[in-house]
Structures are given as C-alpha cells and as structure tokens.
Interface confidence: medium
C-alpha cells in the first residue's frame, strides 16, 4: 500500500535519509574473505551518517528500502591476470543476523581488474553488510578506485 | 551529528533535489584530457536542475552529499582495440576550486569498451566536476552510451 | 525555473517516491529480445511501490526524473564466450507509448559477463521501460546477478 | 555453412588402436568445444568425450576413461580420438558434434558429422 | 553419473495431433544459475541427430515452434503441439549439466 497519512507534514528526521560512504582499510586474514571497510572526514571523503562500523562491516541503523553501491578495483592487475586467475569474485550480502544471511549483489571480474555495481533493496536496523571478495588477487586501496556505500531511499 | 532541528517542518526548496544529467559535447584538443558536456531539453533527455555548466564542465550550486555516476563508452572498440591501447582510463574528480581537486572515481578500460561507476560523496557550492579520458580511444557520443550526472542527496 | 512554491509544506505523499526493483523471470520467445521482471515480496527482495509491471515489462505512473539501473549476468559465460557470442548488447529504453519510444542506456558485454550501469531520465506517467537483450547467451536468473530497477528521484 | 567430417574408421581387431579425425569448416574452430558421441549398431546415443576450444580441458565417458584420447589442432581445423586397447563393446558410428558454444562443455551439440562407422572385431 | 530415463520408449501418433514424451533425471539437472541443463535431440532415420531444446526450454535455430520444452529440476517433457510425418525418428534427452555428459534410452515416434 501507498502512504496511510500522505497529507501528514513530513518532519526532517523522517527523511531518513541515512547515508555511508566507505573506503578500503584492509582485507581480512586467509580464509576470511571480507573486506574491512573505515569511514570519517578525517580519512578523505568517506563518511556516517546513520549507519555505523561494526570490525569493519556496515550495520544499518533504519528500516528501508536502501541503493547499495559499490566499486572494486584490483590491485595488481591486467586482464591477462585477471583472466588467469579468474574466478575471482565480489559478492555482496547481509552476513548478520544469520537469519537473513543472503547475497544481495556478485560480480566476477573475467578478463576486467575493475567491477562497480548498484542496487535497491530493503534493509532493517541490525543488518549487517558483508562485502567478499573471493581469489588471489588483491583489491586497491586507492580512495578513487574502491569504495562501498548506502544510501537510504524510502521507508 | 545527525539533524539538529529534527522536528522541523520541511520546505519543498529545503530538499535540494539539484540533479543533473548531461550527454558528450566533445573531447578537449590535444593535451586536453577532459569530455566536455552539454545538457538541456533541447538535446535531448539530459538536463540541469541547480548545477550549471561552465565551459562544458558541471559547477555544483548547493552544499550536500551527492551521488555521482557516469558511463563511458569507447566509440571505435573491441575487446582487441581496448586492450591493445591500454591503458585507456577515466577518472571524475574535483578540478577547480584548486584548493578543492582531487579524484573522486577512477576506472580503467582494460579489455572492455565500456565503464560505468557512482559514489556518494560531499560537493560543496562552487565545485567544478571533471572528467577525464587518458589514452588514445575517442568516447561515442551516442546519448544512451556516454553520460554524466548528480543528483543531491542529502545536506 | 526552481520551485514556485519554495516554502510550501511538503505532503508525504508528494514526495512520490516511487520505487521499484525487479528480478528476472525469463526471456522472450524467439526473435523477442526483451527481458521479462517480476517482483514482490513472495519472491524475495523484489519489489513495486508505485510502478507496476505490464506483461513482464516495467510501468512508469508518475512524473518525474528518475534513477534507472540495471545489472545483467550472463548465465553460462566465460570471457572466451562472451567475446566469441559478441556483439551481445543490453539495451534500456522506453518501448511504449510510440511516440516517446527512445533508447536510454546501452552496453556491450566484449569480454565481460556482467554489465552494470544506471542513470538519470526524466519519465512520465505510462512509459514503459523494455530491456532488450540482443546476441545468442542467456542471462543469469540469480537475483544477485540479473536485475532492474527505478527510483523517483525529483519532479 | 558449418561442417563437420569424420574419417577413419575401419575395421579392426580387439586390442588394436585407431585415430579418428574430424575435419571442421564454416566456422572458427578454435572457438569452439567439440565432442565425441557414439551409436552402437540398433541402440542409442553415448556421449564419449569432449575438449574445450584451447585443449585446455577433457573430459571422458567412464566406458572409454583411460583408453581414448581426445585431441584438436586448432592451426588445422581437425579433431582427433585416439582409441587405443579396442573391444568389441566399442563397435560404433562415431559422430564428432560442435559443442553449442555456450562454453566450453556446458550446452548443447548444435552441429554433428555424418559418422564413421568402428567395428571391433577378430 | 547421473542417469536419464525417458517414457514411453515408443510412442505412435498421428499428424496434426499433439504428442509429448517424458524425461526423468536421477537428480536435478538445475544449474545455480537458473537454468536446467536438459537438452533434446532428434534423430531422424538413417541421419545423424539434430539439435531440438537446450536448457531445458529453448529452441535451438531453425526448429519449428511446434516443438515445446518444459520443465524443471528433474521432470521434463518435450511437447509437438501438432505432429507432421518429417517428425518421426528418436527423440533423445541429455544431461548437460556436469560430465559424463548422459543420454536417455530414446523414444521412437512413428506415425499411426
């Protein structure tokens, strides 16, 4: 259903409008394949506003309908290696509560060093987002070439 | 912080909602790296609503967060041609006020004729956007292939 | 020109907010290259606030611009296939009315087996968006890898 | 147009070995899997093997697996089965068919030779 | 190995009328990528087989859209909506899904 009260004057606060852009820290120990992500004007240009950091992985603050982005670049790479080492792949996904475990977003790179994507779908407060990265090549952790990040869309 | 004034009626200009959306004018001369862009109804479905364009490049009016997004197709391209003039990259970024440059989103060809990226970052009034193409392959100007754009998302 | 009415109140409701975000559900017959959605909560994270689904086809039913995005996956696909199979061509673009009917978004898939992309369009109430995939590979069905969707974005 | 020619079949006696050729022309070979299916005399369709389009990857029907060698030499057009340690439950039309091209051995046979005829037999 | 089963073995008709057969894998031939990896070939008496259905529901180039295929995980079925004599000869299933690659036995369509 549409909107129960749409004449209802609507308070700055419910916008919602909760929003992260994350840049790369590192990348996890063998065997964890999660990226560890780190936000805040202190380190450039990414920032928190309603999500939060929780060891690196996103957590979600407001029940919605979120754009989920996100930019991988490898590090060391051409497309020959790219292909040769192929599949290396990201996937996107809420990694916790395990309840709603579930890949939201995957992406191989092929013969391509670089993968970027984008899309909707409804998040709630306590989601967790995990972004795994699977293969033997490393990501870039240039501000301008990797980069995750949310943005609340609707209730 | 989050919203000082929360329970604040909200204003429809309050919202922002600056967008724009431009198609490919014409690359630079020699030594120019930068795509020059162009938009208005009268092209076509591109469009500015609040930034401006000053000498084929997009002037930010309003202090926010914004979501940037371009794609970038290589007129004249295989998989051959792409990989045989690499690296052919493209690169968003903050040009001018000089204070203020700096990349924001970087994306190389590789073996593909096609990028395409967003990020959510902060744009303050009075940024000029550039985008640059290096390498030796011209991108097509086709307005379903090639095209830039902002939208505002939040203050 | 801006907004008229600067410092009216802002209804919930006006905001529009239409939102909508689709899975696949199968090709076309022969010598249809259009992808046929679906979405709704019984299916998993797909969902229709607003716009609605016609024969499979995406329904616009407000005025606006709008944020089109769309992943597509190649189901069985190796960059060696892909560039073998090449051209396979993903196209976005408004297939009905007649009159308004435009190709918004394009790209090839050369050596790669994902394409994603997303961009700006003004759309008005009653365009309906097809998805043309062109070339002789299938598409993933995966919701992670294959799927489509809008955002109202500003009037 | 696509074709697809077998060769080499014959008549020969169990434990002996034979090489089959399948010459391929109207497409780009060497972008393309291939395989081996054969037919018994009166019974139906078997699959014996298929190579990817570089040779990079075989794979083998159990009934063959350390006896038959599926080969391609891209630079010629040609495919190849060495059958080696022949039995009479080898007796076939033997038909080389174009992978679908999908990728390397996940589609369809969508073209196929006119077979060659193997008899194993004393 | 995975092991395909096809009913019935022979099946008479008559043209202009509808005809289907039944294929039957030992476990699912549903690829994680959406698809069922199940194809169907013809062979027509005295010729090498043709390509008729792959994945399941797709007709390969220049097969007629009288031919049908449906189906998911471990059911199919092959489907002429109206039979004509050039359709006689055996109708073969395979599992495309993972090597060895497997027939089923064949059904033969013969007209009335």
């Known amino acids: 259903q549409r909107f129960a009260q749409a004449q209802q004057q609507l308070p700055l606060e419910s916008l919602g409008w909760d929003v992260a852009e994350l840049q790369l820290n590192h990348t996890g120990p063998q065997q964890d394949p999660r990226l560890y992500w780190q936000g805040g004007p202190a380190l450039g240009r990414s920032f928190l506003h309603g999500p939060e950091l929780d060891k690196g992985q996103l957590r979600i603050h407001r029940d919605g309908i979120y754009m989920v982005h996100i930019q991988v670049t490898l590090a060391i790479c051409s497309s020959t290696t790219a292909s040769r080492h192929h599949p290396t792949t990201l996937a996107v996904g809420i990694c916790s509560p395990a309840s709603r475990s579930i890949s939201l977003l995957r992406l191989s790179f092929h013969q391509g060093c670089t993968i970027a994507s984008q899309r909707l779908t409804p998040l709630a407060r306590g989601d967790t987002l995990c972004t795994n990265l699977t293969g033997t090549l490393l990501p870039s952790r240039n501000t301008d070439e990797t980069f995750f990040g949310v943005q609340w869309v609707r209730p | 912080q989050r919203f000082a004034q929360a329970q604040q009626q909200l204003p429809l200009e309050s919202l922002g909602w600056d967008v724009a959306e431009l198609q490919l004018n014409h690359t630079g001369p020699q030594q120019d790296p930068r795509l020059y862009w162009q938009g208005g109804p009268a092209l076509g479905r591109s469009f500015l609503h609040g930034p401006e364009l000053d000498k084929g490049q997009l002037r930010i009016h309003r202090d926010g967060i914004y979501m940037v997004h371009i794609q970038v197709t290589l007129a004249i391209c295989s998989s051959t041609t792409a990989s045989r003039h690499h690296p052919t990259t493209l690169a968003v970024g903050i040009c001018s006020p000089a204070s203020r440059s700096i990349s924001l989103l970087r994306l190389s060809f590789h073996q593909g004729c096609t990028i395409a990226s967003q990020r959510l970052t902060p744009l303050a009034r009075g940024d000029t956007l550039c985008t640059n193409l290096t390498g030796t392959l011209l991108p097509s100007r086709n307005t379903d292939e090639t095209f830039f754009g902002v939208q505002w998302v939040r203050p | 020109q801006r907004f008229a009415q600067a410092q009216q109140q802002l209804p919930l409701e006006s905001l529009g907010w239409d939102v909508a975000e689709l899975q696949l559900n199968h090709t076309g017959p022969q010598q249809d290259p259009r992808l046929y959605w679906q979405g709704g909560p019984a299916l998993g994270r797909s969902f229709l606030h607003g716009p609605e689904l016609d024969k499979g086809q995406l329904r616009i039913h407000r005025d606006g611009i709008y944020m089109v995005h769309i992943q597509v996956t190649l189901a069985i696909c190796s960059s060696t296939t892909a560039s073998r199979h090449h051209p396979t061509t993903l196209a976005v673009g408004i297939c009905s009315p007649a009159s308004r009917s435009i190709s918004l978004l394009r790209l090839s898939f050369h050596q790669g087996c994902t394409i994603a992309s997303q961009r700006l369009t003004p759309l008005a109430r009653g365009d309906t968006l097809c998805t043309n995939l062109t070339g002789t590979l299938l598409p993933s069905r995966n919701t992670d890898e294959t799927f489509f969707g809008v955002q109202w974005v500003r009037p | 147009q696509v074709q697809l020619v077998e060769s080499g079949g014959g008549v020969v006696q169990p434990g002996r070995s034979l090489r089959l050729s399948c010459a391929a022309s109207g497409f780009t070979f060497s972008s393309y899997g291939m395989h081996w299916v054969r037919q018994a005399p009166g019974k139906g369709l078997e699959w014996v093997a298929v190579?990817?389009?570089?040779?990079?990857?075989?794979y083998y029907a159990d009934s063959v697996k350390g006896r038959f060698t599926i080969s391609r030499d891209n630079s010629k057009n040609t495919l190849y089965l060495q059958m080696n340690s022949l039995r009479a439950e080898d007796t076939a039309v033997y038909y080389c068919?174009?992978?679908?091209?999908?990728?390397?051995?996940?589609?369809?046979?969508?073209?196929w030779g006119q077979g060659t005829l193997v008899t194993v037999s004393s | 190995d995975i092991v395909m089963t096809q009913s019935p073995l022979s099946l008479p008709v008559t043209p202009g009328e509808p005809a289907s057969i039944s294929c039957r894998s030992s476990q699912s031939l549903l690829n994680s990528n959406g698809y069922n990896y199940l194809d169907w070939y013809l062979q027509k008496p005295g010729q090498s087989p043709q390509f008729l259905i792959y994945?399941?529901?797709y007709r390969a180039s220049g097969v007629p859209d009288r031919f049908s295929g449906s189906g998911s995980g471990t059911d199919f079925t092959l489907r002429i909506s109206r039979v004509e004599a050039e359709d006689v000869g055996v109708y073969y299933c395979?599992?495309?899904?993972?090597?060895?690659?497997?027939f089923g036995p064949g059904t033969k369509v013969d007209i009335k």
């Open positions: 994945l399941g529901s």
């Open positions: 395979i599992n495309s899904l993972q090597t060895p690659f497997t």
């Open positions: 068919a174009r992978d679908g091209g999908y990728s390397g051995y996940d589609s369809g046979f969508d073209y």
């Open positions: 190579i990817w389009y570089d040779g990079s990857n075989k």
